[in-house]
């Protein structure tokens, strides 16, 4: 099946301009946004620090860790009240992402 | 509203020992990383250090032995400087290290002078 | 030693115009695009503009444009105006575990013509 211009591939996502059209389904994550083409029981997340298609179940229950969203070699956790996850590099750094 | 604020710096001779204070509101030092920088008058931005939650703070290669960064309770951040000099004369910020330094606190100046 | 050469040191401006602000780290950022750009005026802490090399912050104009990866990066302020005279930062962010987790670069005063 070929693809339209500026169409996306089912299970796939990009990353867009703040400006671009807002009739796209869309989700903030650490402030990037994203336009994302996500089959049947996925939503748009985020995997390896990138927007991604990610399983539905993740987002309902709140166990965002499961989406792999942090960089490989990082670790992740919950914050209090799974209100976002903490990324944290291997030197200990750590990256906070909320989600609203 | 996630804000900063530093204090405690004052005018102190060569060779004291001075500690800063940044108390964050808004946000939670359990969850994201704090970093000090200075300004010495008219002159750029430098990095002293890092400290995120329970991990150990890193400090700017210059900046080891000198400086200590802790977390002193679950809202402040301490600086001490030990031996200072004329050359560590400077605004102090600390800012929320996360995505970028954002918010910064509006900085609170340290003189060092006989 | 974790070094981010920043380049032009100044540069001026007409209302309207184009500013290109280079920064080139001395080895490879954090995940490749872990540098920010700051912008300060005097007697203010810096402020914000963009992080991961492309992302704009929260409320800032988008006549700021970031580019680059790995360790070249490039600041773009378009149809430059009044209020953009300040000096303005890159920071690049390392692993913590081998280097200086941060660093700044020297810096980029822009004046308006």
């Known amino acids: 099946q070929f693809l339209k211009e500026g169409q996306l591939a089912a299970g796939t996502c990009e990353v867009i301009a703040a400006h671009r059209d807002s009739s796209q389904p869309r989700r903030t994550i650490a402030r990037q946004t994203a336009r994302c083409a996500c089959r049947k029981g996925q939503i748009a997340g985020t995997t390896r620090a990138r927007p991604a298609c990610v399983d539905a179940r993740i987002i309902k229950t709140k166990q965002w860790c499961d989406m792999l969203p942090c960089l490989e070699g990082e670790g992740c956790d919950l914050l209090i009240n799974r209100s976002g996850w903490t990324c944290t590099q291997p030197g200990g750094r750590i990256k906070t992402t909320t989600v609203s | 509203q996630e804000q900063l604020v530093e204090s405690g710096g004052r005018l102190v001779t060569p060779g004291t020992t001075l500690t800063l204070t940044c108390t964050v509101s808004g946000f939670s030092l359990s969850s994201y990383g704090v970093s000090w920088v200075r300004q010495a008058p008219g002159k750029g931005l430098e990095w002293i250090g890092y400290?995120?939650?329970?991990?150990?703070p890193h400090y700017a290669s210059w900046a080891k032995g000198r400086f200590t960064i802790s977390k002193t309770s679950s809202t402040t951040v301490d600086l001490k400087m030990t031996s200072l000099t004329t050359e560590d004369t400077a605004t102090y910020f600390c800012?929320?290290?996360?995505?970028?330094?954002?918010?910064w606190g509006p900085g609170t100046l340290v003189t060092v002078s006989s | 030693e974790l070094d981010l050469t920043q380049t032009p040191s100044s540069v001026s401006a007409a209302v309207g115009g184009t500013v290109t602000i280079n920064c080139q780290a001395s080895?490879?950022?954090?995940?490749?695009?872990?540098l920010a750009w700051y912008q300060q005026k005097p007697g203010q802490p810096p402020k914000l503009l963009i992080y991961?090399?492309?992302t704009l912050a929260s409320g800032v104009s988008s006549r700021f444009k970031g580019s680059g990866s790995g360790t070249q990066f490039t600041l773009t302020i378009s149809d430059v105006q009044c209020d953009d005279a300040a000096t303005y930062y890159c920071q690049g962010e390392f692993s913590c575990s081998s280097a200086d987790c941060n660093a700044f670069g020297g810096g980029t005063e822009l004046e308006i013509l």
């Open positions: 400290i995120a939650n329970n991990y150990n």
């Open positions: 080895q490879s950022v954090y995940n490749n695009k872990n």
């Open positions: 800012a929320r290290d996360n995505y970028g330094m954002d918010p």
């Open positions: 991961a090399a492309s």
